[in-house]
């Protein structure tokens, strides 16, 4: 039994087209082997009509194509301008025609619906443009040209060469008479409506010698593409409306009751509140195509979506549109993870990000959603050792705990860190998830000194105070770098005196740097974790300076340790004035300019459909 699968029988009508999808097991051999469509002969052979290697039979020239979708294990044969001669028995298959890795397909093309003789059929999508061509003879070259539409029994004038335009077509129709060499006039109708469909008659001249041509205009409302995505996952709607609307405002809307279509997002800056933080409208290409990504899918996101183009940025009659029916699968493969994470000013958050566990080698990213204009998501960190300059020392992406989850730690929180963040990879684009960070009232749990200066060649001891609530947690110190935070040895110094109402279970854990070198300068974190699951962290910047006097430095939280220009808080912790210390974060502006990866590598600078969509899949 062949593993190839497809439609056993396909029926269509003369002049129309078919798309025949053949399914194959998506092994690496099958993905890359030749795909073919052949016609079975009476004596059992199968004559190739089109193949994935570029061959197209003269019978199919200009009207057929074969497209392989290796990531889906499918290939599609499109055949247009069908005639009854195309009726017959075919095979779609892999490899060599005679080898048996194929599926038999019977194609039957019947005569089209009863049209008047000499009727030209125009099949055009809603909102698009049609050009109806009307030939005439020399004797009618100077006579009136007109287009009528058959309404019931009567032809109604739509447009003529004397300047008349039927009110139903105002602003969207024109009559063009070709140069003297060509005996042809054309009527161009834009922004086609469903009501434009019907029988038309074009005429040159008004007497018995007039030239007439029948046209049948079929206006197609787009069939919604069925899209099934998992709860908490993401969907991408790719919208290609054609170059003629490249400069017209674009929108995505969701159909509610009846014909209403509520704008989800548009290029005029409108965005539905329900999609705040989880939607991006990616900039359009020159051809007017664009895409919309929605993450954190909810049950209530299911429904019919339309994308379109109209100067108002919303659905209007005559808008060219594409449609999708989105189903949200509640039996999701994407695990539940918190959609809101809370932290306090000066404190930290640890965010768990799910990814497709089959793609453990994929690059992981974290980006900050920005709502301005159509939404964007500039990358902040990735798993390959890149961190946005402004986040150095306070942001880390860890592959732990692994097996379908990675961790992002952000500390030294300020109110500016509140917002929506996206977890994503360069693999399965359906696994984009969203988390909102909220900054709430409160004090950080871990207490560390504000800034520390170490002396070359001496020993430095830096304290970190852990309250009793973390008594069962593993406590650690590590040195931050852009690939993570390398664990360092630390000493448990016994109970901490830094907490009121906290018993012997509080802890003071110190980091000791012996014989300090220039390489010791940088950010150090103390933190808590349980196994591979990370909790709170606190950061200290250690600056290194030349020796002034012998001895070792033991940094405490005491007021006496305050440096000039520092504001000492009652608790003994310091709020450092910007001018007091050369904190690397204070030079974010200069660093951002110098950070060539941030500038040159567009795929890192901002997440859009280009940054992680390249690998395939659209909304399917």
């Amino acid at each position: 039994k062949s593993p190839i699968f497809g439609p056993e029988e396909v029926n269509s009508v003369e002049g129309n087209s078919v798309s025949i999808t053949c399914y194959y097991p998506p092994t690496s051999v099958n993905r890359h082997t030749r795909k073919y469509w052949c016609r079975q002969g009476a004596r059992g052979g199968c004559i190739t009509l089109i193949s994935s290697e570029g061959y197209v039979s003269s019978k199919y020239a200009g009207r057929a194509n074969l497209t392989n979708f290796p990531e889906n294990g499918t290939f599609v044969v499109n055949i247009a301008q069908l005639s009854q001669d195309d009726s017959g028995r075919y095979k779609c298959g892999l490899g060599i025609n005679s080898r048996g890795l194929s599926f038999d397909v019977s194609l039957e093309v019947s005569q089209g619906p009863g049209l008047l003789n000499d009727t030209k059929v125009y099949t055009v999508d809603l909102g698009r443009t049609v050009t109806i061509n009307c030939p005439f003879k020399t004797e009618n070259a100077q006579k009136r040209k007109s287009l009528y539409k058959q309404i019931g029994l009567y032809p109604v004038l739509v447009i003529d060469s004397s300047g008349y335009v039927n009110p139903n077509y105002t602003g969207r129709i024109r009559l063009d008479i070709q140069g003297t060499g060509q005996l042809l006039f054309s009527v161009v109708i834009n922004q086609l409506r469903l009501s434009d469909a019907g029988q038309y008659l074009c005429q040159a001249g008004d007497d018995s010698n007039s030239n007439k041509k029948n046209a049948d205009l079929q206006v197609l409302k787009p069939e919604p593409e069925l899209v099934y995505e998992d709860l908490r996952g993401s969907v991408t709607f790719h919208c290609a409306l054609g170059p003629e609307v490249a400069n017209v405002a674009k929108f995505l809307c969701r159909q509610s009751s009846g014909e209403n279509c509520d704008v989800v997002v548009n290029t005029l800056g409108k965005r539905a509140p329900a999609f705040e933080g989880r939607i991006l409208l990616n900039p359009q290409d020159k051809d007017g195509s664009f895409s919309v990504v929605i993450t954190g899918l909810r049950k209530e996101d299911a429904g019919r979506y339309l994308c379109g183009a109209h100067s108002d940025g919303q659905l209007q009659e005559g808008s060219p549109i594409q449609a999708w029916q989105l189903f949200v699968n509640e039996e999701s493969t994407i695990p539940r993870s918190p959609t809101v994470v809370k932290g306090v000013a000066g404190g930290s958050v640890a965010v768990l990000c799910p990814y497709n566990r089959k793609e453990s080698k994929s690059i992981k990213y974290w980006c900050l959603w920005e709502g301005a204009q159509n939404g964007r998501c500039p990358l902040l960190v990735d798993s390959e050792g890149w961190v946005k300059a402004q986040y150095e020392g306070r942001l880390s992406l860890l592959e732990e705990p692994g097996n379908g989850t990675f961790t992002v730690i952000l500390n030294q929180l300020t109110s500016r860190d509140a917002g929506f963040y996206w977890c994503l990879t360069n693999g399965d684009t359906l696994w984009r998830t969203t988390v909102e960070i909220k900054i709430i009232e409160g004090e950080p749990n871990l207490k560390v000194p504000g800034n520390v200066t170490a002396v070359l060649g001496e020993t430095l001891k830096v304290p970190c105070h852990f309250p009793c609530k973390f008594s069962s947690y593993e406590k650690y110190w590590c040195k931050w770098n852009n690939t993570g935070c390398q664990a360092l040895p630390s000493q448990d110094e016994g109970p901490s005196k830094a907490f009121v109402n906290c018993d012997e279970n509080s802890r003071l854990v110190s980091l000791t740097l012996n014989l300090v070198t220039r390489a010791d300068e940088g950010w150090y974190w103390c933190g808590v974790k349980q196994g591979h699951f990370y909790g709170e962290t606190a950061a200290v910047y250690v600056a290194v300076e030349e020796r002034k006097a012998a001895g070792s430095r033991d940094v405490s939280l005491a007021k006496a340790d305050a440096a000039p220009d520092e504001k000492v808080l009652d608790s003994g912790f310091r709020e450092i004035e910007n001018k007091a210390i050369q904190d690397p974060r204070l030079f974010a502006e200069e660093k951002a300019v110098a950070d060539t990866r941030d500038q040159a590598d567009g795929s890192r600078a901002s997440v859009d459909s280009g940054s992680s969509e390249e690998q395939g899949g659209s909304s399917r």
Partner: nanobody, 127 residues
Framework: QLQLVESGGGLVQAGGSLRLSCAAS????????MGWFRQAPGKEREFVAA????????????YYADSVKGRFTISRDNARNTVSLQMNSLKPEDTAVYYC????????????????WGQGTQVTVSS
């Protein structure tokens, strides 16, 4: 929400015929790909046949499982929102509960959606 109701099941002798019908309501029918699955006692649900209609190109696509090719015929009536399965030359191994389903074609195979199933109709073929 699409509702699907099957009818036409029953007891028939081997070699006989039955015609199953599935009436759909609640959503525009012409946009769906519809099909039949069956589940015999103690076995997994299996694909039987499907029909796909593209109003854009006035084309219809028919899919069948190997085990029913040449014996079963699927058809649909858009005006009446029904899908039918004509079953000829029935065999005892065709005994099962037959389910009408809304389908999606995805990644290399036919895959049913659990959210759009009928309740099923019993077909019993006696020898």
């Amino acid at each position: 929400q699409l509702q699907l109701v099957e009818s036409g099941g029953g007891l028939v002798q081997a070699g006989g015929s039955l015609r199953l019908s599935c009436a759909a309501s609640g959503r525009t029918f012409s946009t769906s790909t519809m099909g039949w699955f069956r589940q015999a006692p103690g076995k997994e649900r299996e694909f039987v046949a499907a029909i796909q209609w593209s109003s854009a190109s006035a084309s219809t696509y028919y899919y069948y499982a190997d085990s029913v090719k040449g014996r079963f015929t699927i058809s649909r009536d858009n005006a009446r929102n029904t899908v039918s399965l004509q079953m000829n030359s029935l065999k005892p191994e065709d005994t099962a509960v037959y389910y009408c389903a809304n389908l999606v074609f995805r990644v290399g195979a036919l895959k049913e959606r659990d959210d759009y199933w009928g309740q099923g109709t019993q077909v019993t073929v006696s020898s």
